[in-house]
């Protein structure tokens, strides 16, 4: 007998190669300079295959002695850039991603760009910048968001199963109506889980479910009409 | 693209019966509910039942019970809608849907006149 | 069963307005439903499946959200071809019940 189990819906989002920045213009910079020294670590999602674009303190450059940008990644030697006004050279110790690079060249502009973010680059970014004036810093917790694959299917008589799968972080299911429902996760070695949620439906005049996932790349739902029961031919509804 | 074709109109008698067909393609006949629904002139749609043609498995709205008999035939991947006991009240646009209510029919006028 | 209200029941438009209607579940209940325009003689065509999701070659100035267990559809700036009646399908629960429409008519 044929199974909606092979009905499978699949969802994956696609997203055109965008940029994030936390980056101010110089009319933000003059307004807000005392607010942001102040706040010298950001937590900030990125969606991974994004691009990514990472901001000293608004500091003018005239006023520079040393910038040095530190790169703290999982499971990786700190690396540092830096960049020597009074010399103009730039120096780097143990880097090794070719997609961190300066936006531009330092002397001109000391932000620090991430061409199309990968789970690896999931780390902390601190800018340090020297002056006469002392030291400013201001430090990026970057956390990668990696958008769910959803799928969702028919295993057995009035049971569902809706999973996403390697999101990051780990996505959140409910279901319309609610059923009988068991939720496991699976963490995987890059960071991402998946999330698996089996329920079960006894009512009878429930037609159609919808699994609905929430995260923080964005929601989707799908839905799926539930088999009949074998052996049921005929009932009034 | 899954493509409903149904019968043509028809017009009843009182008392009389009316067997409207459905035929499906596109899709995995066996493995979608089919559902019917009618509209009565310049009123709203009501459901009257659904069959799942993989089984056999068949719920009929209470209002039509005892008055309503849905079939398919997997062979053409043809669903049939019979509905018996006519009267005028019946007159509506029947429709079949599947796909979860997204693929229609173009509908078939039904005229339950004497 | 549940009960499909739908509002408003009529609606006199502009071209160019931003039209909403909304279907709500008797009691609240949480479903899922789909949105569908239907012009005189002819079957309903589907704009939204799913609440939320438009459908292949419907214009983008058609959308629909949820909000709680209130179902709206919004026509960003009307056009004279979209004079019709829209309504609502749920289809959550047997028996599948419609909202009774939403008739768009020229001022």
């Known amino acids: 007998q044929p199974n909606n189990s092979l009905m499978l819906q699949t969802s994956k989002e696609n997203h055109a190669l965008a940029s994030s920045s936390l980056c101010m213009d110089e009319k933000q910079i003059t307004q807000n300079y005392s607010k942001v020294l102040a706040e010298v670590n950001t937590s900030w999602p990125v969606k991974m295959a994004t691009n990514a674009v990472l901001c000293c303190p608004p500091i003018a450059l005239r006023n520079l002695i040393i910038i040095t940008w530190e790169i703290i990644l999982r499971g990786q030697p700190s690396c540092t850039k830096a960049y020597k006004k009074e010399t103009n050279e730039t120096k780097e110790t143990n880097c090794t991603d070719e997609r961190i690079t300066w936006v531009s060249r330092p002397d001109q502009n000391s932000d620090l760009q991430i061409r199309t973010v990968a789970i690896t680059h999931d780390g902390y970014y601190r800018c340090i910048m020297v002056t006469p004036d002392g030291n400013f810093h201001r430090g990026y917790h970057l956390q990668v968001l990696v958008t769910p694959e959803v799928t969702l299917f028919q295993n057995r008589n009035r049971t569902a199963v809706c999973k996403a799968v390697a999101g990051k972080p780990a996505a959140h299911i409910s279901w319309i109506p609610e059923g009988d429902c068991a939720t496991k996760q699976e963490y995987w070695s890059n960071g991402t889980v998946t999330v698996k949620s089996t329920c079960h439906w006894e009512v009878h005049n429930v037609s159609t479910v919808t699994c609905h996932v929430s995260h923080l790349t964005g929601n989707k739902s799908l839905y799926i009409e539930l088999l009949p029961v074998p052996g049921a031919k005929k009932s009034a509804k | 693209q899954v493509q409903l074709v149904q019968s043509g109109a028809e017009v009843k008698k009182p008392g009389a019966s009316v067997k409207v067909s459905c035929k499906a393609s596109g899709h995995t006949f066996t493995s979608y509910w089919m559902h019917w629904v009618r509209q009565a002139p310049g009123q709203g749609l009501e459901w009257i039942g659904n069959?799942?043609?993989?089984?056999?498995?068949?719920n009929y709205d209470e209002k039509f019970q005892g008055r309503v008999t849905m079939t398919v035939d997997t062979s053409t991947s043809t669903a049939y809608m019979e509905l018996s006991s006519l009267r005028s009240e019946d007159t509506a646009v029947y429709y079949c849907?599947?796909?979860?209510?997204?693929?229609w029919g173009r509908g078939t006028l039904v005229t339950v006149s004497s | 069963d549940v009960q499909m209200t739908q509002s408003p029941s009529s609606l006199s438009v502009s071209v160019g307005d931003r039209v909403t209607m909304t279907c709500q579940a008797s009691?609240?209940?949480?479903?899922?439903l789909h949105w569908f325009q239907q012009k005189p003689g002819k079957a309903p065509k589907l704009l939204i499946s799913g609440a939320s999701n438009l459908e292949d070659g419907v214009p983008s100035r058609f959308s629909g959200s949820r909000y709680g267990t209130a179902f709206t559809l919004t026509i960003s700036s009307l056009q004279p071809e979209d004079i019709a009646t829209y309504f609502c399908l749920q289809f959550t629960y047997i028996p599948w019940t419609f909202g009774q429409g939403t008739k768009l008519e020229i001022k």
């Open positions: 849907l599947t796909m979860t209510g997204t693929s």
């Open positions: 009691q609240g209940t949480p479903i899922n």
């Open positions: 069959i799942y043609p993989g089984s056999g498995s068949i």
